[in-house]
Interface confidence: medium
């Protein structure tokens, strides 16, 4: 167990041209606050996936009133740290999202309004117990400077907060096989704890790193209740008379999801699927409009008729959910025949067929390519009684004997210039883009190219939003 701490040093316009104006309207004073979301590992997780390591919201900063015409200064910040407690081991590698929100003040009907100013995200390696790490991130024309660290809560120590320290039982030395606890030399290292995440209620260990389950529980972390088909009694403790194992109380018992959200159990706890207009761990945050950017993954937001349907997200292919937050796993339907490999590209489904098969779903059994020669490194592809050559870069024609113009298909995105090269093609990218095909913006705009904003926050205790 421990705490991840984040200290925001400054938020303001970044260097270079295009510095933003003040984020406050001349009409409405405003103040800033920050939200941090942590996820374990270095995976490229979508912005809307749960903050599995935890999340925190800062206090509101001082009120800032724009001086008309003045450029945006570094804006006044909230006091104090953002602290995200973690219960299990510190993973060592983590992903973060830090959002800067603007709260508009004034005499607005319906109270203050919130809007997302900037979102930065990154993936880092960090050992618990180490010094503060400093970072600078840019979102569009904004720049955020911050420091962070992970520290263990006593009695946990170590880079993952998995070692425990206890006061010495004897004044002179630690017990057999146990070392003094640096830097707490007057304490001794306790035996290593059970496997990270092992249920404290239903699991135990006799060897460091293991997780053995009490009767009635199973799974690698002892979080899954055992059920037997012969037992029809309701949830409750194991019945001594029948010998039945009956699952204990589940994380979805009593439905922790508010506002009509539906609960589903996950290996570690539960997940709420929220109805439109609500979000948050327990669907507790409401009052979302299109201005809050509630549609993820490029979903199109359309204003709804009333507060119960304040917006509707029209999802692009490959995404679903009231906020387009769920990727449709179309490969789970196993659409590719004859052992083909399914690839869900988001905008489309592709089947990569095994040799000897072709077609959109690998449904065609092809003729043999034996004895057919494709020149210049081309490969023979079977198909409908005739062979076809898949030519290497720079060649074309039926047998790959003709030189092809690799630039003919206009492969360079965003206005990049294409140049034929002996090894294929080279893209000279337009200003602001990079990548082999100029497909990546160099400085993605904070509002549009970054992942979509979560729905707007609403008045109340900031802790509600976690």
């Amino acid at each position: 167990a421990g705490v991840f701490e984040l200290q925001i040093h400054s938020f303001g316009p970044g260097p270079g041209p295009g510095a933003p104006r003040s984020p406050c309207s001349a009409r409405l004073p405003c103040r800033l606050f920050f939200r941090v979301c942590l996820k374990p590992g270095l995976s490229e997780e979508a912005a809307e996936s749960p903050c599995a390591l935890g999340a925190a919201l800062s206090a509101r900063g001082p009120v800032y009133t724009e001086q008309p015409g003045a450029p945006a200064p570094d804006l006044p910040l909230p006091d104090g740290l953002l602290q995200v407690p973690f219960r299990d081991a510190w993973p060592g590698t983590f992903s973060f999202i830090i959002e800067t929100w603007r709260e508009e003040l004034g005499d607005q009907i319906g109270g203050p309004a919130w809007s997302l100013l900037a979102r930065v995200a990154g993936r880092r390696r960090l050992a618990a117990g180490g010094p503060w790490a400093r970072d600078i991130q840019r979102a569009g024309a904004w720049e955020l400077r911050f420091s962070y660290r992970a520290r263990c809560e006593p009695p946990a120590v170590g880079t993952a907060c998995t070692r425990l320290c206890r006061p010495r039982s004897a004044p002179s030395r630690c017990g057999p096989g146990l070392r003094p606890c640096a830097p707490l030399e007057d304490e001794c290292e306790a035996p290593l704890v059970c496997r990270a995440g092992c249920s404290p209620e239903h699991g135990f260990c006799e060897q460091p790193g293991e997780c053995r389950c009490l009767e009635g529980w199973t799974g690698p972390l002892c979080t899954v209740p055992v059920s037997t088909s012969s037992c029809l009694s309701p949830r409750g403790p194991s019945s001594a008379t029948t010998g039945c194992l009956v699952p204990g109380p589940g994380p979805c018992d009593g439905n922790p999801c508010a506002n009509g959200g539906s609960c589903s159990e996950t290996p570690r706890s539960f997940e709420c699927t929220c109805p439109r207009g609500f979000y948050g761990l327990r669907c507790e945050v409401s009052g979302v409009t299109c201005a809050d950017g509630p549609c993820f993954n490029g979903g199109l937001c359309v204003g709804g008729a009333d507060p119960d349907s304040a917006y509707i997200c029209h999802c692009p292919p490959g995404f679903q959910g009231s906020n387009c937050e769920k990727r449709v796993d179309r490969c789970s339907l196993q659409p590719c025949r004859n052992g083909g490999l399914c690839l869900d590209l988001g905008h489309a489904l592709r089947c990569r067929c095994r040799a000897g098969f072709a077609g959109p779903r690998c449904e065609h059994d092809l003729d043999d390519c034996a004895g057919r020669a494709c020149a210049n490194g081309g490969t023979c592809v079977e198909g409908g009684g005739a062979h076809r050559c898949s030519c290497a870069l720079g060649f074309g024609g039926r047998d790959c004997r003709e030189r092809a113009d690799p630039c003919a298909a206009r492969p360079c995105a965003h206005g990049g210039r294409c140049y034929a090269h002996f090894s294929g093609l080279v893209c000279a990218c337009a200003p602001g883009y990079m990548g082999a095909r100029c497909e990546f913006p160099v400085h993605p705009d904070g509002a549009s190219a970054l992942p979509a904003a979560p729905p707007g926050l609403r008045p109340g205790d900031p802790q509600r939003y976690l």
């Epitope: 009409r27 004034g106 937001c301």
Partner: antibody, heavy 117, light 107 residues
């Protein structure tokens, strides 16, 4: 029901003065920021003055075109906002609307001000 | 000053049509944009504030969208009472400025 009612408009000589009044009802006037907006065929809709609430020290703001000639004021006890216009010019001719709240949520029916040469 | 431009000064549409009116700002107005409806009798009503937030009492067939310098008002199902002139206005920076208006007529 929210209601804003302007009065005091009419015909005035070039260089003359006029005071417009706006009576408000149906909302908490003392909380509201109040504005005057005018409309003419030549210039369309044009913001003229803003006065904030007591919490904002009744701060006032004007565009350059009327600064020094127009003064906005308010009387929270009477739920009224005023626009004192001095040194009037031909380009000040138009319908003057009283509007309330920072989002310009509520508008009156307007009162016509005509400045003659 | 920030200039607000409504390129279409008049628009003709049929009842039931989906109508979109656009507005462009000379610089980023950071979503501080309102849409108003002015009826032929001069009555002015706020429809949308802060780009897309529907003012209370406004029918849901009205919606707003946009960001930075480009904004639009959409009427999803045109009704007879929607015949009016529509104005955009920025309140990001003083002086607060209005577009020239788009007059909507029935075919």
């Amino acid at each position: 029901e929210v209601k804003l009612e302007e009065s005091g408009g009419g015909l005035v000589q070039f260089g003359g003065s006029m005071k417009l009044s706006c009576a408000a009802s149906g909302f908490t006037f003392s909380d509201a920021w109040m504005d005057w907006v005018r409309q003419s065929p030549e210039k369309g809709l044009e913001w003229v003055a803003e006065i904030r609430n007591k919490a904002n020290n009744h701060a006032t703001y004007y565009p350059e075109s009327v600064k020094g000639r127009f003064t906005i004021s308010r009387d929270d006890s009477k739920s009224r906002v005023y626009l004192q216009m001095n040194n009037l010019r031909a380009e000040d001719t138009g319908i003057y609307y009283c509007t309330g709240y920072s989002s310009f949520a509520y508008w009156g029916q307007g009162t016509l001000v005509t400045v003659s040469a | 000053d920030i200039q607000m431009t409504q390129t279409t000064s008049s628009l003709s549409a049929s009842l039931g049509d989906r109508v979109t009116i656009s507005c462009r700002a000379s610089q980023d107005v950071i979503n501080y944009l309102n849409w108003y409806q002015q009826k032929p009798d001069g009555t002015v009503k706020l429809l949308i504030y802060y780009t897309s937030r529907l003012h209370s009492g406004v029918p849901s067939r009205f919606s707003g969208s946009g960001s930075r310098t480009d904004y639009s008002l959409t009427i999803s199902n045109l009704e007879p009472e929607d015949i009016a002139t529509y104005y955009c206005q920025q309140y990001s920076e003083r002086p607060y400025t209005f577009g020239g208006g788009t007059k909507l007529e029935i075919k």
